[in-house]
């Protein structure tokens, strides 16, 4: 007789998953030589250990603690970039301004980014066919917990001047709900941060409206004012030729705004 | 029917090396990963490491770090073990077992073991 | 390390007994357990695993139970047969380790 088991409404855990995460670990520490030391079986260890067997909606901040202490990374404080929304420019960014870093850059972001995993309480089956969603079945399930752990640590890491891309083609440029609006806003240090600097991204080609007064971003320079840090803001024009210009600097076409 | 065979009984001087062999069958050599663990003498069993042939990385208790090579031959569907500077406490009956990649279950085979004897 | 600790480290009993072993973790472990059974001159058997769930063929007379640090493999019936040393192991974390074996023999 089959088990019944839990329907949830999101995927299931991502094919191959632990063969993924392994894979993305022997692969990070092979290019990261200060990662080197990381055994990658013992991170699998930690990973399985905060969500296997566990009911997949009571998932604590607790539960990765092991596999947070194994990811222990060093990045340098001040070359932080924030996302929210726009997660494929970020990344295109940090590939080629290698001195800068998104939280998927680092061991932990990497393994986990655009994966989804979940087990079920009482047995030490991974899930395959069906995970909690966030709004439709509960917000402490393994993938959001997980990602609100590591964006928590990496903000709190964050000081000096601090960047965040936000996407201008959205409705709400800054979203309180979002990972960045609901956590990493709360959680960068005053006394080490100076500066959050965001860069609004615009779509379209024609579009030059000052997307720095939209309503939104004044809630966030509100947020941020009252966290006794100061607020900058710069409008990206041109996403294709911001990145043009971080490639190539010395480009003539670089002096003028993008 | 899964098998894991290993290779034959070894004896061995203090401070020379040891390779010895377990050969997978009936089962899909990389969807698994294979450890090593030995039995001294009337004594229990003792963890050495872990590999996986799929992606090719291994790991080890510390206390045969620098002495344990663990690895494996896809082609031929073999894990090897091999240790260097023998002892006499290395006296040992060595067992390979398998294990899914994921660690989710217990080492479900094991081979038939493989005694060395190390004496001058 | 997590240390694994077995008692008793031999007993008696006579067939139709009841037999308890129990195994305790250094630290917590959740239900990365296994329970092994070995004879003279063989390899181990697997014989629980996840602390409670039966290898595929083991007979249903065994049994496993706990979590956490605190394990108990049972045999409810003891047969013949299952006179051998029993192992528990931890899965948890690296490097696996093992209890030091209890030695089940004929009273």
């Known amino acids: 007789v089959p088990r019944w088991r839990q329907q949830w409404s999101g995927p299931g855990t991502t094919k191959r998953f632990p063969e993924t995460v392994l894979a993305r670990c022997v692969k990070y520490t092979e290019i990261h030589p200060e990662m080197r030391h990381v055994d990658c079986q013992s991170v699998w260890d930690a990973f399985k250990g905060a969500f296997i067997s566990k009911h997949p909606c009571n998932i604590t901040e607790e539960d990765y603690q092991p596999l947070m202490k194994l990811g222990t990374q060093t990045v340098p404080c001040n070359k932080i970039l924030l996302w929210s929304r726009i997660k494929d420019l970020a990344h295109q960014f940090t590939q080629v301004q290698r001195d800068m870093f998104t939280l998927e850059d680092t061991l932990l972001g990497y393994l986990a980014d655009d994966l989804t995993w979940c087990g079920e309480f009482n047995t030490s089956k991974i899930n395959y066919q069906s995970c909690p969603d966030w709004r439709k079945d509960c917000s402490n399930n393994p993938v959001s917990v997980f990602w609100k752990t590591v964006s928590r640590r990496f903000a709190e890491a964050a000081c000096d001047v601090v960047h965040v891309m936000l996407n201008g083609s959205r409705s709400k440029i800054f979203d309180k709900n979002s990972t960045f609006g609901s956590v990493e806003v709360h959680n960068l240090q005053p006394e080490k941060v100076q500066t959050l600097e965001a860069w609004v991204i615009h779509g379209g080609r024609e579009d030059s409206r000052d997307l720095c007064q939209d309503p939104t971003i004044k809630e966030l320079e509100s947020i941020i004012s009252k966290r006794n840090i100061q607020f900058s803001c710069k409008n990206i024009y041109r996403p294709d030729k911001f990145l043009q210009c971080v490639k190539n600097p010395e480009d003539s076409s670089c002096t003028s705004e993008i | 029917q899964v098998q894991l065979v290993q290779s034959g009984a070894e004896v061995k001087k203090p401070g020379s090396s040891v390779k010895v062999s377990c050969k997978a069958s009936?089962?899909?050599?990389?969807?698994?990963?294979f450890s090593w663990v030995r039995q001294a003498p009337g004594q229990g069993l003792e963890w050495m490491g872990r590999?996986?042939?799929?992606?090719?990385?291994?790991n080890s208790a510390q206390k045969f770090q620098g002495r344990v090579t663990i690895t494996a031959d896809k082609s031929t569907s073999t894990a090897y073990m091999d240790l260097s500077s023998l002892r006499s406490e290395d006296t040992a009956v060595y067992y390979c077992?398998?294990?899914?990649?994921?660690?989710?279950?217990?080492?479900?085979?094991w081979g038939q073991g493989t005694l060395v004897t190390v004496s001058s | 390390d997590i240390q694994m600790t077995q008692s008793p480290s031999s007993l008696s009993a006579s067939v139709g007994d009841r037999v308890t072993i129990t195994c305790r973790a250094s630290?917590?472990?959740?239900?990365?357990l296994a329970w092994y059974q070995q004879k003279p001159e063989k390899a181990p058997k697997s014989l629980i695993y996840a602390a409670s769930s039966l290898q595929s063929g083991v007979p249903s007379r065994f049994s496993g139970s706990g979590s956490g640090t605190d394990f108990t493999l049972t045999i409810s019936s003891l047969q013949p047969e299952d006179f051998a040393t029993y192992y528990c192991?931890?899965?948890?974390?690296?490097?696996?380790?093992f209890g030091q074996g209890t030695k089940v023999e004929i009273k």
């Open positions: 077992a398998r294990d899914d990649i994921a660690a989710l279950g217990p080492f479900d085979y």
């Open positions: 192991q931890q899965y948890n974390s690296y490097p696996r380790t």
């Open positions: 009936g089962g899909t050599f990389s969807s698994y990963a």
């Open positions: 630290q917590g472990i959740s239900s990365w």
């Open positions: 590999v996986i042939p799929q992606l090719g990385i291994a």
